[in-house]
Every structure is written in structure tokens, then in C-alpha cells.
């Protein structure tokens, strides 16, 4: 079945209340424009936004009779010229009949004859309808032929895109048949279909077919108020195929359309032949698109690559929600125009300022104000991280402006990272010097403490993403952060006293839930050494609080459970609701604060892993006055387990010197290897292995320069910890570097038990853990341990 | 073919004004834009303003704010160009010029010579 | 004083390339297109390229633009006596929301 046979059907069904063979009709109210219901209009109760109201009529070809419901009686079948007359198309009838077309649709023959009702005649220009009626003969024939076809076709055999010839020099008539049911002809629509005749068939047509011969190249040749449109179509080498055969829509801007645009916007447009073309290139579809088959919102993809929603009004038509056209359905022989009269803007033609919404206002204006804007050179390369308005305080915008520079220049990258280039671990630049740490979670994407909005747009010199807070940099390590806060100086040296003040303060990515001093209310400092006296259960109770990953609060799909695993090896449980995070459904007093190693979420109480019993009857009394939320077990005589703190620590290679350094000059054309030992680097990012994201940790003992050397390499040892020694040595070994891999898979970052995987590699004195493999692998120089 | 026809030469004194036309055939004048350039003797040009045919919305030259003013009237097809408050380095060629925006200043008129002289 | 500086002679003998170069800002020529205008002695200003490199119907293809940076030029080959002009190159200037044209270049033909 074809749209136009469904949406009858759909029609038929609303209006067998009424009778056999009734259909429902909607009338757009304050017109006389009706259509067969849609499920979809039907249910709206509107077409174009505007309400309609139920009409009930026969189905085509069925009609009533006296006395009886509904519309029982089939309509008589007649020739052609007779079925004009039961339609109701009397005009298209007697112009039949004065034009001598008459004899020959009564005849011999199978014609298909799109016949314009009596109203679309009366629409018609007086001056040209005037031309027709004094030339009958000739004029009025040619038109009258040309809304014939040789050939009985229903409109299910009226496929979109066809052209078919009709019975005037073979002029083409363009059929549109759309997914709601709209079939058009040059874009006049089929308001009755299908009333067959002994010799053919007639579809009422709501216009009369004027005559085409030219092409939109043409059009826009002929046409002095689309000159500027015309213009900027030669520049951008796009005239000569608006000349081609195609089934375009062309939305043509007219001059006063150009007028309205800023004079600097299109003076860098037209300078610009990417952005020109793609300002020309979002006006043309590659699809035909009448008026009248628009009866809602529908995107269309231009030949620009970016789509458009046009929409309609009443019997106003809008481009993205704004009503623009003026003048609807220019008939081609190569597709239609619709004059508008404003200019459409794609994002590719806009510099990456231009495409800020009104959500991001106070960003673009601090921007300019600040003098940002001006270092976003037109053919430089950047990314806005904009932050909507209302993430701007009172507090902020009245801040020195040289603190609210250096804040703004933190949303400001130095390259163009478009949505689907950012990844977990990934580290941007701003143009600040700064370094923002990307979060990829399952249903947002951070950086730092700020999430992204919808919203994401690329320009021609960059990129825009929307935040829904000002982003802030870390600047302190976890210990330091806790530090500096007197609300966590008992959770502190219960850290200190577990020997984990390292892990806080190395570089990595946690996720630490730290427990004010609140949640030690009552603890005397009996208790207090008996926690520390028990070195495993301290580690154990500490280590519960620490995930590896960062996962930030606003990062959480709002109201689902996140299941983590936690250093100490029990799941924890996270939820985000109401902006507040739950933690083992436990409020978080304060959550997301950055650090450079991760991020703290504030806890008023102790976390107690729910899985582990505990074996002392003191220390479960201790627990049981600081840990409310859960019933924690007792089991008499067991033991907390020892973790393995090597999985966390990093691996330090260890160089032998053998003998005393070799001094020699080193004569000219001799180049030095040199080894630079750092701090361990701890990178993390995700990659797709298998369809599965895998969480990739790579820990490296050193960073490596290399200046090449032809026969003699040095390796010069920094041994760090405040020592100056150097020490010289004859390299011996090949082996320069030896890199530790953690690999840490599941599904995105909920780490369950078997999923867990571990490589070690290298000589590092660990305790073998039993669940994992351990790996001597090759030397492998990475990209991030080579440094220029 | 496109012509701009201006008015003829005048000679005004100092603190004085000067309105000059500029009337437009061969082309519909609703659909273009006009701009003004004038051209101070042995100098270069310079840019006063621009006026829509259409809308009679107007862009001046921030420097010429407040003394010049731009008009059209489109039953003529003229466009009109006042400056106010002359001075004697107003003395120029003023030029009208067909103003697409996308294609600028394609057509222009022969020019008007104005004298600021005491 | 013009905002786009330009050499203020160039000459060359018929049948040879002149080049004629245009320098401006980031706000003017950096940020916009570049158009050039001639005028002959005693008449009026003529349109001789728009948007950089476009010529109008009716100029010959012996005029060509281009622009690269804050920086633009206009090249004549096939140099005639009939091309002795001054040459303007002009620009959108977004900082001062005017149009600047260039102090021109007198092209002699040798």
C-alpha cells in the first residue's frame, strides 16, 4: 500500500462510527484546507500547530443516499469529462468543454487528469487566468494538457520522485509521494484521489500547474532580488549545479535577506571560500520538498551536511523554528524554491564565539569584555568549554578582573576537540597553560568537576561545549587537600597511621570518600589505638573508602545504582539523586572536589564493607558505635586479610652501576644518551577491546630522552628524594626501560571481581598475588615516556 | 545597463550642508543596497556609509555619526546623501556606489565634486 | 591615513606581471575578504575583484586577486597601457565596524 492508501485507510477506520464508508477529514480552522486524518494529526488534534476540527465525508468514491447512514452507494463510473463533474471540479469541466479538450477525455484513450478544483482556479492570477480564457483554443488546451497523462495512474502508482510526461510537449510533471500521506504534483497536492473513469482517472489537484521550463540555475539568473544569493552561488562555484538535473529544494535568501545579516559576518564569510560554500551548500537539499507535504516539524539533512527542521504554522513555513518563508513552491524542472528572507547560517561557516546559545551569554560577554575574544583567531584552531549562565555567581562576575581572566582562559583550549574525540584520561591544554583531565562516564562526559549539557557544536575555527559549572582546575593532591582541611584530621592520621599517606599523595586516579571527624563522634583514644593497633583492620576500613577511578557525583545517571569496587575489594554502592550522592545510601555532605590525583566526596559517617566480619569483640563494639547504617557481622577468630599494597605502589626499576663512571670527552660528532629518572608516570584511558571498554593504567618508572649515539651512551641517574649525586655509567644493557601495566577491565568503570585483570611487569619485589598473571614482557618505549 | 546618475558640483561654506542624489535605472532599485564613498582631492577613498533600497536601514561610518544622513526615496529610485556641519576637509569627490553587500560597490556614479570653501 | 598600507607606485613595461600588495591587520584583511577597485585618472572608481579572487563579468582574466594571512595582492599580467590606474584595495575592518579601503597603488605603464 502506498502513504496516501495507509493514511485513507487510517481515515477510514476514524469515521466508521459514522457509517460504512465514511472518512475522517481534518480542517485546519479559519481555512478551507482539509486533510485525511493522520494517526499522528489525529491524536494532536492539529496540523501546523494549528487546531483542526473533525469533518466526515464520503470516502472517495462512495457517496450517501437519502435515509440511510453513512455513504452506502458507490458513485457512478463516467468517462473522464463526466468524472470532472462528480468531483465537484466544474471549472476544470467547462474549460474541458470550451477548449475542445472535451471529445477527447469522453473518447477513446486511458488518461490520468490532475484537475484543479474550482477554488484553485479562483487563486489563480486574474491576469493569467484572463490569457487562458481569451485563447481557448490554444493557451487554455496547452495549460489543460498539461495537468493530463497519457495513462491511467493511481496514486499508488505515483512513486516519489518519478517525472512523467504529460500531454503537453511532454513537459515533466514531478510526483511527491510522502510518509504522511501528502502526494504532489509541481507541488500542487492531491486533495481527492482516485475517482476512477471508464477511460482513466482523475486526482483533484488544490492549484493550477503553471508551465516549467527552467531550471533553479535559471530562476536565480532571472531573478534580480536573488542577485545576492546569485553571487555568492558563482563564488562559491554551486551556480552551474543548481542548472543540473536533480530534485533539489533551494531556500533562497533574497537580497533584503543578505541586508539583515551583520556587514563583518558576511564580509568573513565571503572571504572564506570553506565557510561561503557551506553557507550556500545549507540552503540547497537533495530532496524535493513542496509546502503542503509539510503538515509538521521534519529535519532534512542539506547538502551542507547539517540538517535543518522545517516546520510549519498555519500556512506559514519555518527553518529552525523561525518563520521565514515568503514565498513557497517556485516550481523548477529541477526541483523547487521557497524565498526566504533571512540568511541561514550553518555551524561549519560560524567562528567558534558565534556558536554560543543563549544559555551561554555571560560567558561569550565576559569573553569579549576580558579581551579573550580577540586571541580566537579566524583561522586559528580552539575549544569553548562554555559554562551555562547561571553557573556564574554573584560572587564570580564581581571578582578581580585578572582572577575572572585567568578563570575564563580555563575554558579556552588551545586545539579543536570535537565530542567524539574526548575519551577517558584524555588531558587538554587551555590557553592558560593549564591541564583539564576529561571523564568519560556511561551517560556524561566531565571535565574536571563540570559535566557537559547538551548542546555540543562545531564551527570553522573550533569547537563549543556546553558545562553546567565553571571548571576549576586542580591544584592539590588528595593528603594535601585533606590537609588543609581541619574536618578530616582524624581520618588523616588513621591514614598516616596505616602507612597509606603515599597512595593520596602519588600520582593516580582515585576516587577517595572521606569521612569528616564527625564520623568518629564518641571514639575515645582507647579505641583509637585499638583501631591502629590492628594494622589490616585499619587498611581494610581505610581502603574501603578509596576506588580506583575517578568518578565524579554529576557524573552518575541521576537515580541508578553505580556498583564500584573499592581498593579494599568489597563494592561500594553510588547513587546520584536530587544533585546529592548517595554513598551506600549514606548523603554526602559535599561532593566533587578535584584533586590532582582525584577526586573527594565528603562522608559524615564510617564505611564498613557489608561482606566483612569481624572476629574481636572490642573492635566490633567500636564499630558498632560508629557504624549505624549497616549491621556489621561477627564471626569469632577471623581475621581481616592483608592487601597487597604493591598493586598500588609504583614499580621502581633498579639500575646496577658496575665499576667506576668512564669519563672521556666526548669528541665532536658524538651524541649522549641520556635517562632522565622522574617521579612515576601514571597515565589512564580507555580503549575499546572487543566491544568491552577496557580502563588501560600505565605506571612508568622513567621518563627517556634520547639523543642519538653513534657508538658511546651514557645514562646519566637524577636518584630525586632532595640527593644531587650523579653517577655516570657505560651503558651495558640494551634494556633502557621497563614499563609496569596495570590493565583494569569491565564494563565502563564498574570493576566486578572477575573481571579484574592485572599485568606485572618488570623485577618489582611483590608478593605474588594469586589471582593475577605476571608478565616479563619486551621493553616498550610508550609515546608519554618519550620526552622531546 | 546599470546606471547612477548624481547630482552636479556644489560649493558650500563652512558649518554649512549638502545634500547630494544619486538616481538609480536599469536594474530594480528595492533589491540593492547604496553606498556613499567620497574622495578627498589627491587622497584615497573613504568609506561614509551604506543605505538598504528596501528597508531604508542605514550603516554609517562611526566617524561621520551624527552629520551625515542617508535616504531613498523609491518612487524616483534616487538615494540621497546629507552631511551636515561642513567643514573645509569635507571638500571631496562624493561617489554613490550600487552596494549587492555580497558583490560590493559593483556600479558607481560619475561623482559629485563638494567645496567647502569661506 | 589609511588603515590598509599599500605600496604607493608600481610599474612595468606592456606585456609584463605588476603586482600590486595590500597589508593589514587581524581585524581587517586577517578576519575578512579583500576587494579591489581601479580607477583610471578622472573617473570613477571601477569594481575589479570581490571576495579575494571573483572577477565581475567584464574584467579580464589578466586581473587576478589573492590573499594570504593579514596580506593581499592584485597581479596584472600582460600589462597594457590601458591599465595606467590607481589600484585600491579595501577591506571590512571589525574593530572600527567600517569599510577601509587601502591609500592605493599608481600603476605606470613603462
Known amino acids: 500500500n502506498s502513504y496516501y492508501d495507509k493514511v485513507l485507510a487510517h481515515s477510514r477506520i476514524r469515521g466508521r462510527d459514522q457509517g460504512p464508508n465514511v472518512c475522517a477529514l481534518q480542517q485546519i480552522l479559519g481555512t478551507k484546507k482539509k486533510y485525511f486524518s493522520s494517526c499522528k494529526n489525529w491524536y494532536q488534534g492539529a496540523i501546523c500547530g494549528k487546531k483542526t476540527t473533525v469533518l466526515y465525508e464520503c470516502c472517495p468514491g462512495y457517496m450517501r443516499m437519502e435515509g440511510m447512514k453513512g455513504c452506502p452507494a458507490v458513485m457512478p463510473i463516467d468517462h473522464v469529462y463526466g468524472t470532472l463533474g462528480i468531483v465537484g471540479a466544474t471549472t476544470t469541466q467547462h474549460y474541458s468543454d470550451v477548449s475542445k479538450l472535451r471529445e477527447e477525455i469522453e473518447g477513446k484513450g486511458s488518461y490520468t487528469y490532475f484537475a484543479p478544483s474550482n477554488e484553485a482556479w479562483e487563486n489563480l492570477d486574474s491576469d493569467i487566468r484572463r490569457g487562458l480564457e481569451n485563447n481557448v483554443n490554444v493557451e487554455l488546451l496547452n495549460a489543460l494538457h498539461s495537468h493530463m497523462v497519457n495513462k491511467r495512474m493511481l496514486t499508488k502508482d505515483l512513486k516519489h520522485g518519478m517525472v512523467i510526461p504529460s500531454m503537453y510537449n511532454n513537459l515533466g510533471l514531478f510526483i511527491n509521494h510522502y510518509p504522511n500521506g501528502v502526494v504532489t504534483v509541481n507541488c500542487a497536492r492531491v486533495i481527492h484521489g482516485n475517482q476512477i473513469a471508464t477511460n482513466g482517472v482523475v486526482h483533484v489537484i488544490d492549484r493550477v500547474l503553471t508551465q516549467i521550463g527552467t531550471s533553479i540555475q535559471d530562476f536565480l539568473e532571472a531573478e534580480d532580488d536573488l542577485s545576492s544569493f546569485r553571487a555568492a552561488a558563482i563564488t562559491s562555484d554551486l551556480l552551474e549545479s543548481l542548472g543540473r538535473d536533480g530534485h533539489f529544494t533551494l531556500f533562497a535568501p533574497t537580497n533584503e535577506a543578505f541586508e539583515k545579516l551583520p556587514r563583518g559576518v558576511l564580509e568573513r564569510i565571503m572571504g572564506d571560500k570553506v565557510a561561503s560554500e557551506a553557507l550556500m551548500k545549507y540552503h540547497i537539499l537533495n530532496t524535493l520538498q513542496c509546502s503542503e507535504a509539510i503538515t509538521g516539524g521534519a529535519v532534512f539533512e542539506t547538502m551542507e551536511g547539517n540538517t535543518i527542521e522545517i516546520g510549519c504554522e498555519g500556512d506559514s513555513i519555518s527553518i529552525n523554528g523561525i518563520k521565514m518563508v515568503n514565498k513557497k513552491d517556485i516550481v523548477t524542472k529541477n526541483g523547487v524554491i521557497h524565498l526566504i528572507d533571512e540568511v541561514l547560517i550553518p555551524d561549519s561557516a560560524k567562528q567558534v564565539i558565534e556558536l554560543a546559545g543563549k544559555q551561554q551569554t555571560t560567558f561569550t560577554d565576559l569573553v569579549a569584555q576580558l579581551g579573550l575574544a580577540s586571541s580566537l583567531k579566524p583561522d586559528g584552531e580552539y575549544t569553548l568549554l562554555a559554562p551555562v549562565n547561571n553557573a556564574f555567581s554573584d560572587d564570580t562576575l564581581s571578582m578581580d578582573q585578572r582572577l575572572l581572566k585567568l578563570i575564563l582562559q580555563n575554558h579556552i583550549l588551545k586545539v579543536k576537540v570535537g565530542l567524539s574525540d574526548l575519551y577517558n584520561g584524555q588531558i587538554l591544554e587551555t590557553i592558560g597553560g593549564k591541564q583539564l583531565r576529561v571523564f568519560v562516564y556511561r551517560t556524561a562526559i566531565c571535565i574536571e568537576n563540570s559535566c557537559m549539557v547538551r548542546g555540543s557544536k562545531q564551527g570553522r575555527n573550533g569547537a563549543i561545549h556546553i558545562f553546567r559549572e565553571i571548571i576549576q582546575p586542580a591544584e592539590k593532591s588528595l593528603h594535601d587537600k585533606l590537609r588543609q582541611d581541619k574536618r578530616f584530621s582524624i581520618f588523616l592520621s588513621l591514614l598516616e597511621a596505616a602507612d597509606l599517606k603515599d597512595l593520596l599523595t602519588q600520582p593516580g586516579d582515585w576516587t577517595l570518600f572521606a569521612p569528616t571527624n564527625d564520623a568518629f563522634k564518641g571514639m575515645t583514644s582507647e579505641e583509637r589505638e585499638l583501631l591502629i593497633g590492628d594494622k589490616n583492620a585499619l587498611q581494610n576500613i581505610i581502603l574501603y573508602h578509596l576506588t580506583p577511578g575517578v568518578y565524579i557525583g554529576k557524573g552518575f545517571e541521576p537515580g541508578v545504582t553505580n556498583i564500584l569496587k573499592t581498593t579494599q575489594g568489597s563494592k561500594i554502592y553510588l547513587k546520584g539523586v536530587n544533585e546529592t550522592l548517595l554513598v551506600n545510601e549514606l548523603k554526602s555532605k559535599e561532593s566533587d572536589i578535584m584533586t590532582t590525583n582525584g577526586v573527594i566526596h565528603v562522608v559524615d559517617k564510617l564505611l564498613y564493607p557489608a561482606d566483612i566480619p569481624v572476629g574481636n569483640d572490642q573492635l566490633l563494639e567500636l564499630l558498632n558505635k560508629l557504624i549505624k547504617y549497616i549491621q556489621i557481622k561477627f564471626v569469632r577468630g577471623s581475621t581481616f586479610k592483608e592487601i597487597p599494597m604493591t598493586v598500588y605502589r609504583p614499580a621502581m626499576t633498579k639500575i646496577q652501576i658496575e665499576g667506576d663512571p668512564d669519563f672521556r670527552l666526548i669528541k665532536e660528532g658524538e651524541t649522549v644518551t641520556e635517562v632522565i629518572h622522574g617521579e612515576p608516570v601514571i597515565k589512564k584511558y580507555t580503549k575499546i577491546i572487543d566491544g568491552v571498554p577496557v580502563e588501560i593504567t600505565e605506571k612508568q618508572t622513567r621518563e627517556e630522552r634520547i639523543i642519538t649515539g653513534p657508538e658511546i651512551k651514557y645514562t646519566r641517574i637524577s636518584t630525586g628524594g632532595g640527593e644531587t649525586g650523579e653517577t655516570l655509567q657505560k651503558f651495558l644493557q640494551k634494556e633502557v626501560s621497563k614499563v609496569t601495566k596495570f590493565i583494569e577491565g569491565g564494563d565502563g568503570h564498574l570493576f566486578e571481581d572477575e573481571e579484574i585483570k592485572r599485568l606485572l611487569q618488570g623485577d618489582t619485589p611483590a608478593k605474588k598475588i594469586p589471582a593475577n598473571k605476571r608478565v616479563q614482557g619486551p621493553r616498550r618505549r610508550s609515546r608519554e615516556g618519550r620526552s622531546q | 545597463q546599470v546606471q547612477l546618475v548624481q547630482s552636479g558640483a556644489e560649493v558650500k561654506k563652512p558649518g554649512a550642508s549638502v545634500k547630494v542624489s544619486c538616481k538609480a535605472s536599469?536594474?530594480?532599485?528595492?533589491?540593492?543596497?547604496i553606498s556613499w564613498v567620497r574622495q578627498a582631492p589627491g587622497q584615497g577613498l573613504e568609506w561614509m556609509g551604506w543605505i538598504s533600497a528596501y528597508s531604508g536601514n542605514t550603516n554609517y561610518a562611526q566617524k561621520l555619526q551624527g552629520r551625515v544622513t542617508m535616504t531613498t526615496d523609491t518612487s524616483t529610485s534616487t538615494a540621497y546623501m546629507e552631511l551636515r556641519s561642513l567643514r573645509s576637509d569635507d571638500t571631496a569627490v562624493y561617489y554613490c556606489?550600487?552596494?549587492?553587500?555580497?558583490?560590493?560597490?559593483?556600479?558607481w556614479g560619475q561623482g559629485t565634486l563638494v567645496t567647502v570653501s569661506s | 591615513q589609511s588603515v590598509l598600507t599599500q605600496s604607493s607606485s608600481a610599474s612595468g613595461t606592456p606585456g609584463q606581471t605588476v603586482t600590486v600588495s595590500c597589508s593589514g591587520s587581524?581585524?581587517?584583511?586577517?578576519?575578512?575578504?579583500v576587494n579591489w577597485y581601479q580607477q583610471l585618472p578622472g573617473t570613477a572608481p571601477k569594481l575589479l575583484i570581490y571576495s579575494n579572487d571573483q572577477r565581475p563579468s567584464g574584467v579580464p582574466d589578466r586581473f587576478s586577486g589573492s590573499k594570504s594571512g593579514t596580506s593581499a595582492s592584485l597581479a596584472i599580467s600582460g600589462l597594457q597601457s590601458a591599465d595606467e590606474a590607481d589600484y585600491y584595495c579595501a577591506a571590512w575592518d571589525d574593530s572600527l565596524s567600517t569599510y577601509v579601503f587601502g591609500s592605493g597603488t599608481k600603476v605606470t605603464v613603462l
Open positions: 587581524s581585524s581587517d584583511i586577517g578576519s575578512n575578504r
Open positions: 556606489a550600487r552596494d549587492m553587500l555580497v558583490v560590493p560597490f559593483d556600479y
Open positions: 536599469g536594474y530594480t532599485f528595492t533589491s540593492y543596497g
